[in-house]
Each structure stands twice: as C-alpha cells, then as structure tokens.
C-alpha cells in the first residue's frame, strides 16, 4: 500500500472511530435493565454517563440528568474523564492529521514536517482509542460487579419468605453504548497505528538516503606509465533521493466518546 493510501485510510478509520467515541459518550444506553430471569416489568430502565432514563409501555420516556458531581461514584467520574480525554485527544489528532495529509499542500511544508505531524496525530489517535477502550472496560467491569452483587442479594436470604414483602432489585447489563465504545476505540487505535506506519514512509532514512561527498584536498592525480590521469570527485552533483517505502500511513485514530454513566 502506498504511503498516501495508508495515511488516508488511517485518517478515515480514525475519523470513524472518533465519531463512534463521541456517539458512545453521548448515548444513554451504557447499561440497560436485565430482563432475563427477572419479573417482567412494564417499565424499562437504562442509564448513560450523564443521565438515566425510564421507558414505559406506552413509549413515554423520561430522562433525568445526574445533576451532582460529588454524589456520583468515583468510577463513573473516571469513566467520564477517560471518554472526554479520548474525545479531546481525537479532536487534536484530527486537526493535526489534516495538515499532515500528503494529499494536502500547505505552503512550503516539506515531507519531514508532514512525517512528524503524521506521527504526532497517530500517537494522539492511539492514546485516544486506548482511553476510550479503558473507559468502556472500566464501566463494563463496574456493571459485572454490580450485576453479581444484585444477583446474590436476590437469591440470598429468601428461604422463608412467608408473609414478607419482596423487593425485586433491578439488575443492569451491558448497553449498546459499551459495544459502540469498544469498536470505536479499536478503530481509533487502528487508525492511529496506520498513521504511525505511514510516517515511516514519509521520513527519509539517514542510512539509505544521505548522499556523502568525498572532497579531495587537492586533485588526486595518478601517474601511470601510460600517463593516464584519473580524478575522482563524487558528491557535489549527487541528488538526495527520497524513497517511499509504501508503508501505509495511519489515519486519524478514532476518538472515543465519553460514555454515559449508568446507575447500576
């Protein structure tokens, strides 16, 4: 694959991933009510990073924002932070990578500058993708922990329930936003790697490309019996050649969206 194609593809993949990260961050379905082996309710609960929602059987949906910072679990705050970091880095990565694209000419920017920018954007996309993946994974781990705790509470101490009032705990399982976040983070990461690979193709390799000039202090004259004079003078007119290794350049890494916090 040519460097231009690699860089362009990396940019597109990262862009798609970045959009996915934003989408995941804004989605309300980070966790959804678990319906398996539960009494069937006419109310469906789901939660995001920023608000929780309830949908009734009529379709009426009511969402309430988490209007507190201090009252929220530290893990939720951490997930929010990771997703926001992913988005911010993705934005910067996209801006940098636009100027780094080989197909775009800006002033007299040479290839070495574009190579550096490509590498920078690639690294930004990689970190953005990793940040989103970690954020989503932390949230998923939180859900799993709470799910099994809820399950244990549901089935423990219910042996002698004669006359007792049951309270059914709402359990939450993985919502669509988690899968969107994982895929988006992965795409952003892959796009970032592709940008880094493309950078290699844009960078002149010293060992391969540097033209060395050998200057004689005087003129090298070799007297031979036949009076033949040979002079050697390499370098002054030798051109520096840039070789493109065809490494695919990575595109903008997809930026991960801060995922919505679901109350679990």
């Amino acid at each position: 694959m040519s460097v231009t194609a690699c860089q362009g593809l990396g940019f597109v993949v990262s862009l798609i991933g970045f959009a996915g990260i934003i989408a995941a961050t804004c989605m309300d379905q980070w966790s959804t009510q678990d319906l398996y082996n539960n009494p069937v309710t006419a109310v469906f609960n789901y939660q995001g990073l920023w608000r929780s929602c309830v949908r009734e059987s009529s379709g009426f949906t009511e969402c309430r924002g988490y209007f507190t910072l201090l009252g929220l679990p530290a893990m939720l705050q951490a997930v929010r932070a990771l997703m926001i970091v992913g988005i911010v880095l993705g934005v910067i990565g996209i801006l940098v990578s636009i100027f780094a694209l080989k197909c775009i000419r800006i002033g007299s920017m040479d290839d070495s500058a574009k190579a550096k920018m490509t590498l920078t954007s690639g690294i930004l996309f990689i970190i953005s993708g990793i940040s989103a993946i970690i954020g989503v994974s932390v949230f998923a781990n939180m859900l799993v922990t709470n799910f099994w705790m809820s399950t244990a509470n549901m089935y423990s101490g219910m042996g002698g329930m004669g006359g007792m009032v049951q309270t059914v705990q709402t359990r939450y399982t993985f919502g669509a936003a988690l899968f969107v976040g994982w895929v988006a983070g992965g795409l952003t990461l892959i796009g970032g790697v592709m940008m880094c690979i493309a950078c290699r193709g844009l960078t002149p390799d010293d060992s391969n490309f540097k033209a060395v000039s050998y200057h004689a202090s005087g003129q090298n004259v070799a007297y031979r019996p036949g009076g033949f004079k040979a002079s050697t003078g390499f370098g002054s007119n030798t051109r520096n050649k840039k070789i493109y290794d065809g490494g695919a350049r990575t595109e903008d890494d997809e930026q991960s969206h801060p995922t919505k916090y679901d109350y679990v």
């Epitope: 309710t41 006419a42 109310v43 609960n45 939660q47 009529s58 379709g59 009426f60 059914v168």
Partner: antibody, heavy 119, light 113 residues
Framework: QVQLQQSGAELVRPGASVKMSCKAS????????MHWVKQAPRQGLEWIGT????????SYNQKFKGKATLTVDKSSSTAYMQLSSLTSEDSAVYFC????????????WGQGTTLTVSS | DIQMTQSPSSLTVTAGEKVTMSCKSS????????????LTWYQQKPGQPPKLLIY???TRESGVPDRFTGSGSGTDFTLTISSVQAEDLAVYYC?????????FGSGTKLEIK
C-alpha cells in the same frame, strides 16, 4: 374525543369460541396499547393482555394464554379478542381499555361486552 | 403474580366526610430509575366501566376533582377523598402498573348514608 365502542352481548354454548370487537375513534389507533380486562359477576378486575396496534406485539397474562387471542385491524381502527373453548367460568363482562401515555395506566375504557356461556 | 390487597372491602360514610382506603402490594411498585410508584387507582360506578383517577400513585388524571388524593410509596398506598360527595358512590380499585401481568385489588366499595 376518545371513544371505544365494543360489540354487543354474546350468548354462546360451552366449548364454542367467540370474537368480540372494540372500535377506537378520536385518537391515533396505532400509537397506543389496547388492553383487555375481564370482570366476572360480582368480582374484581382481571387483566387479560395487551396488544400494540402499531406492530401487533402482544403480551398476555399467563392465565389467559391459549384462551384469549388479541388481534387488530388497523384499517378500521378495531381491536379484537377471541376466546376459545368456552366454559361457564368465562361468563363475564369484557372491557377493552386504551393504554394511557403516563404511568402504564388504562385511561379510556369501552362500555364492556357481556359474555354468557350457557348450554 | 403481584398480589394487591385492599382494605376495607366496604365502608359507609356521610356526605362531606373524609374517607381513606388502603392498598398494599406484595412487591414494591417503586421504580428506582425515576423514583415513581407504578400504582393506579380507578373508580367504577354501578353499571359503568372503570374510570382512571390517579396514576404514579399520586398524580391526578386531568378532570378528576382535587378532593381525590393518592399517596404512599413502595408497597403501601392510600386513596383519600377529602369531602365525599353523593356521586362518589362507587367501587375503588388499585392496580399494579409495574409488573406484568397487571393485577388489581379486590376493590373497596364506598357507600353513602
């Protein structure tokens, strides 16, 4: 205004089937659930099931599965309930009721269809 | 299925009196997601279909007189009529609107002296 007009009283033999109707008017039929409720003589209310006319999705009370079948005809804005293998236990007044937008309530009710199962 | 228990089964009062009737559910009807109780109250007058009075345990349906008040949370609920009128003669049913199948209480019959 919202109205639910139910079909007239039915007198049927044990073992037979009956299909009663509930014609809706005054609102968008496909946007609200339609519920069916049984009230046996001098008894309380029993929820039979619900159907969403928009896509035909149904949810039944386990007790009435196999006994009641809920359907709709969108073109005439009419909901139907068929009761099969009738016995004297099925003698009751059957109401259709629209699912309210809030609180999973039943906000408008038909006048009821009286079913008498007798030999 | 959720059991709904209403008490008393009947009561007789004079016009203008305050009336309170109770409804208990076998499981909590409080949804943690929105902190709403999915309990509904209906009024059924003789020879008529039921009429929606209150949903979400305490929200009056439009057109319902403000003498009807619903309260309670979790498993214990109350319907209060602040000043009974002759037209309030009816059977009052509470309904679980949270779990399928929806279930109704056996009703409280209100009679006027």
């Amino acid at each position: 205004q919202v109205q639910l007009q139910q079909s007239g009283a039915e007198l049927v033999r044990p073992g037979a089937s009956v299909k009663m109707s509930c014609k809706a008017s005054g609102y968008t039929f496909t946007s609200y659930n339609m519920h069916w409720v049984k009230q046996a003589p001098r008894q309380g209310l029993e929820w039979i099931g619900t159907i969403y006319p928009g896509n035909g999705d149904t949810s039944y009370n386990q007790k009435f599965k196999g006994k009641a079948t809920l359907t709709v005809d969108k073109s005439s804005s009419t909901a139907y309930m068929q009761l099969s293998s009738l016995t004297s236990e099925d003698s009751a007044v059957y109401f259709c009721a629209r699912g309210g937008y809030y609180g999973n309530s039943l906000d408008y009710w038909g006048q009821g269809t009286t079913l008498t199962v007798s030999s | 299925d959720i059991q709904m228990t209403q008490s008393p089964s009947s009561l007789t009062v004079t016009a203008g009196e305050k009336v309170t009737m109770s409804c208990k559910s076998s499981q909590s009807l409080l949804n943690s997601g929105n902190q709403k109780n999915y309990l509904t109250w209906y009024q059924q007058k003789p020879g008529q279909p039921p009429k929606l009075l209150i949903y979400w345990a305490s929200t009056r349906e439009s057109g319902v007189p403000d003498r009807f008040t619903g309260s309670g949370s979790g498993t214990d609920f109350t319907l209060t009529i602040s000043s009974v009128q002759a037209e309030d003669l009816a059977v009052y049913y509470c309904q679980n609107a949270y779990y399928y199948p929806f279930t109704f209480g056996s009703g409280t019959k209100l009679e006027i002296k």
